[in-house]
Structures are given as C-alpha cells and as structure tokens.
C-alpha cells in the first residue's frame, strides 16, 4: 500500500532570464527512494539515481543544474519554460510517486512564489 505523499513548491513564478529551484519532498513513507526523474511535460530533464548520482539530459545540459538535494535548478529562463514540471520518485517497495509543479515565467519583475501544496 502506498502511504507516502509528495510535497512540492506548488505554483511558482519567476522572471525571464532568471533562475528557479524546483523542489519536491516525499514524506509519510519508509520506502527507499531509488531514483528521481524530473520531467517537463513531454521532456525528460534530469535523473538523480540514489547510488549513481545525477545525469542531465543532453537537451538541457546548458540550462539545468542538479540540486539542491533532489531538487532541480532551471537557469536562463525563457517564456517557453512556462508549464508543468513533474518530479517522479521511484521507490522500493512502494512504486512510483509523482509531484506536480506549475512554473510561470514572467516578462516583468513581478514574480512571486506560490503556496506549497501536497499531492497524495
């Protein structure tokens, strides 16, 4: 039975040209995290393997940095980066947990962080 929940940074916004940290946290389970995949809608951004470390997709090598922790830092943001991001936790023995973050990249400097929310 999957008892865990994923807490994410929720709906967030950032300025064009700036950086943003995407964060997820898995709680309420003793399952072992074997890997975390970060995806942007249709694209695989990065993989963090518990034993082997990080790999960044060749498509995003210049704009994505690993961490902090199991999070992901997006750099040199463009308006095209607006959209849904998913943290996919592969765990044993529970299986897969998925968290969702919506990022809006703004032209102006009126970028504010949204509230955190949980996905069961």
């Amino acid at each position: 039975m999957m008892t865990g929940t994923i807490e994410t940074t929720g709906n967030i916004s950032a300025e064009k040209g700036g950086s943003i940290i995407l964060q997820c946290h898995l709680s309420s389970t003793t399952a072992q995290v074997t890997q975390v995949n970060w995806e942007q809608q249709d694209q695989l951004l990065a993989i963090c393997n518990a034993d082997l470390g990080w790999h960044i997709s060749p498509s995003f090598k210049d704009r994505v940095a690993p961490g902090p922790g199991l999070g992901l830092t997006l750099q040199s943001l463009t308006v095209n980066d607006t959209g849904e991001y998913f943290c996919i936790y592969h765990t044993y023995p529970d299986g897969t947990y998925t968290g969702r973050i919506f990022l809006e990249v703004l032209e102006s400097s009126v970028a504010e962080h949204g509230a955190r929310f949980q996905i069961p």
Epitope: Q41, D42, Q43, L44, L52, H55, S57, P58, S59, K61
Partner: antibody, heavy 119, light 107 residues
Framework: EVQLVESGGGLVQPGGSLRLSCATS????????MYWVRQAPGKGLEWVAY????????YYPDSVKGRFTISRDNAKNTLYLQMNSLRAEDTAVYYC????????????WGQGTLVTVSS | EIVMTQSPATLSVSPGERATLSCKAS??????VAWYQQKPGQAPRLLIY???ARHTGVPARFSGSGSGTEFTLTISSLQSEDFAVYYC?????????FGGGTKVEIK
Amino acid sequence: EVQLVESGGGLVQPGGSLRLSCATSGFTFSDYYMYWVRQAPGKGLEWVAYITKGGGSTYYPDSVKGRFTISRDNAKNTLYLQMNSLRAEDTAVYYCARQTNYDFTMDYWGQGTLVTVSS
Amino acid sequence: EIVMTQSPATLSVSPGERATLSCKASQDVGTSVAWYQQKPGQAPRLLIYWASARHTGVPARFSGSGSGTEFTLTISSLQSEDFAVYYCQQYSSYPLTFGGGTKVEIK
C-alpha cells in the same frame, strides 16, 4: 516480451525518399523516448534522431538535420523516420531503439532494416 | 561534437583471459558513458550505463569504470560468447556519439 521491428528499407536513388517504420510491442510505447541509430556497412554506429515520448520535441545530428524527420504514433505504438534527399552516404542498416527509463541510453533495439542509396 | 576514441581497434584474447578496452572522450563527459556489445548480424546490446552500472541481465564479468575523459570496459574472464565488437557512447551532449568500436577476437 519487448519487441521492436523495423520495416520500410530498400533500394532508393540519390535524392529520393523513404519512410521507415518501427512497430513496437511488449511495453507501453507512450511512456518511452525513442531513437533511430544507423550503421553503414562494416562501420560503426551513428545516432540519427531522438523523439520525446509525446512527440513534442525532436533532435538530430547535423548530418541529417533538415532531411530526416522522426515522428511517432502512440495510438499505433509505432515510430517513424521520414528520409528525404537521400545520399549515398545514408546507406546503412537503420535501427530503432528504446531509451531506458533510468538513463539516457538505449536498452532495446530492433533487428534493423537496410537502406541502400544508389543509382 | 565530442569524439569518442576507442583502443585498440582489435584485441586478440584467449578464452578465460582478461580483456581491457579503452575509450577516450575529446572533452569531459562526466559519467555519461555507455558500452554496447554487437555480434555479427545482430543489433547492439546495452552492457553498461552511467559508466559503471551493469544493465539488467549482464554477467558480472563485465565491468565499467572511469569518469571525465577516460573510460574502461573490462571483461574479467572471456567466454566464447563474448567475442564481438564493443562500442562506447557518450550521452553528455548532442550530438550523441559512439566510438569506432573494438573487435575482441579469439587468439
């Protein structure tokens, strides 16, 4: 059992076109990123194209960019490679391959289909 | 483009002996390197990913090591089914590139 079966290869004249297909089974096709890789006779491997799982983004090396187009039909569990303006140097066995779900490498490959470009 | 250079081009080894294959990248690729085995008339088979992780079902006699620009595939005790061509591949940046291959043949 995971299976990838390429088809559509054959003899084509320089400047001609060909469309390769890769029929897949044994896994949820729409959950996987896919590749085409080729191998000229007696030569090494060369990456040709990459497509994201929903088909929204594609990537190519300069050697085929603007001439080759990778696409997919998730409803039919099929991957495609449209090859236009073919040249003699495109002669090769073309393999479709599935990206692993834990890395950016290729864990399952088809048996390949031979494309010969010659007049 | 990152050039992957494999050496030697051909390696003659007796069954039961150890084989060491080298792959050098023209620039730092971290641990974004895979090794594939290909037998005549067959498709390549993934052996090693992340420079050192064995793919599912790959015998323990195959091991990978290295990071940055220098990588090694070691076959600790060659079996008859191991005689084949081995390719390294980098997936650190586009275009994805393969080495020219090392043919492991029976001595």
